[in-house]
Interface confidence: low
């Protein structure tokens, strides 16, 4: 089974994410809670990684980009940043489904399913909040499993 | 407050094993990549070994390949390291260090704990 | 493996002056170098990352500049709480080998 490779450069995404990070995580008041679970991400077959990827960036797309209350024009820069770049990694995985790479199986719909779970169980804001904190799991998950990166 | 705090240290005898553990208060350790870094009485610092939590994966410097286990528990949001067939060169002050984040800047640490003594000598 | 090598060892200068250490990497690391500061007895503090970002409260006394494999950390200004050891480190960690991920030999700093 080929990867489905990507060709965003995630030292971009990174960047924007460390420089966000203590601020998302020092509001977080929920410490011991976690959306992306571990051991969920793990569990992942390597036939459901475009999908389960694909999943990940649509949540993060259509409900943690769109539900955070954060004001500070610095912070909404670097998540309209990181945002834009997800939609890149996007583009980047419809070459895989087009060759068929990127079929769902009912693990990685159930996998999903516990991460909106997940979500659903804080009051929307914090949930934003803290998912918006767990961007790194999302960006070692990326990383680990399609990574092909440009040249720095 | 955000804390690290290193136990386990001590004597041990040339050819024995040690095992310590590093306990994470203030945050999830689950969120973050973890080191352990020592540092032989008067010398430099020594990097000896990565655990990512998100991949359950571990990184060893050659040092101590073979010799090193890194682990940790998630409910006890404590971070462990094994380190079998010491030898005196083994001797130094233990650190465990978080690093700033993930892929890119998993090996750069903004937390340290104060660290631990191990003497290895009969 | 990448060798990270450290000079000076020592170097000694007077309040208000200026200090400068150099790293130098076997290999390119790109800007993946941070600087520690250590004093004696207590555990390492981050200063920079990314070669020449300062970390949060760390005084833009400090300054890290360089690429690939010459690095700089520039101490002005100095004061006497800034006698310690410092330390460079590589982590350019999309290397399956953790030696990597490795210290310079040290600087110790002397102020007057």
């Known amino acids: 089974l080929r990867r489905c490779l990507i060709s965003v450069d995630m030292r971009l995404i990174e960047k924007s994410f460390h420089e966000i990070k203590r601020a998302m995580q020092t509001k977080d008041t929920f410490k011991n809670v976690t959306i992306l679970s571990l051991e969920n991400l793990r569990s992942i077959k390597p036939g459901d990684v475009c999908c389960m990827t694909n999943n990940l960036l649509t949540f993060y797309r259509d409900r943690v980009f769109q539900d955070h209350q954060e004001r500070s024009l610095e912070v909404l820069r670097r998540i309209s940043s990181i945002a834009n770049s997800f939609l890149c990694v996007q583009k980047s995985l419809e070459r895989c489904q087009v060759h068929r790479q990127c079929n769902c199986s009912q693990e990685a719909t159930n996998a999903t399913r516990i991460i909106h779970d997940n979500y659903n169980q804080l009051e929307v804001s914090s949930a934003a909040l803290k998912s918006l904190g767990e961007l790194n799991i999302l960006l070692a998950w990326i990383d680990r499993n399609h990574l092909e990166t440009p040249a720095a | 407050q955000e804390q690290l705090k290193e136990s386990g240290g001590g004597l041990v005898q040339p050819g024995g094993s040690l095992k310590l553990s590093c306990k994470a208060s203030?945050?999830?350790?689950?969120?973050?990549?973890f080191s352990w870094v020592r540092q032989a009485p008067g010398k430099g610092l020594e990097w000896i070994g990565y655990?990512?939590?998100?991949?359950?994966?571990?990184l060893s410097a050659h040092t101590v390949n073979g010799r090193l286990t890194i682990s940790s528990d998630n409910a006890q949001n404590t971070l462990y390291l094994q380190l079998n067939s010491l030898t005196a060169a083994d001797t130094a002050t233990y650190f465990c260090?978080?690093?700033?984040?993930?892929?890119?800047?998993?090996?750069?640490?903004?937390?340290w704990g104060p660290g631990t003594l191990v003497t290895v000598s009969s | 493996d990448i060798v990270m090598t450290q000079t000076p060892a020592s170097v000694e200068a007077a309040v208000g002056g200026t200090v400068t250490i150099k790293c130098s990497a076997s290999?390119?690391?790109?800007?993946?170098l941070s600087w520690y500061q250590q004093k004696p007895g207590q555990r390492p503090k981050l200063l920079i990352y990314?070669?020449?970002v300062l970390t949060d409260g760390v005084s833009s006394r400090f300054k890290g500049s360089g690429s690939g494999t010459e690095f700089t950390l520039t101490i002005s200004d100095l004061e006497a709480a800034d006698a310690a050891t410092y330390y460079c480190?590589?982590?350019?960690?999309?290397?399956?080998?953790?030696?990597?991920?490795?210290f310079g030999g040290g600087t110790e700093v002397v102020v007057k």
């Open positions: 260090a978080r690093g700033i984040g993930y892929v890119y800047y998993g090996y750069t640490y903004d937390l």
């Open positions: 203030g945050f999830p350790l689950s969120s973050y990549g």
């Open positions: 655990l990512d939590p998100v991949f359950g994966s571990t």
């Open positions: 480190q590589s982590y350019n960690d999309g290397s399956s080998s953790g030696d990597a991920h490795v």
């Open positions: 990314g070669a020449s």
């Open positions: 290999a390119s690391i790109y800007e993946y």
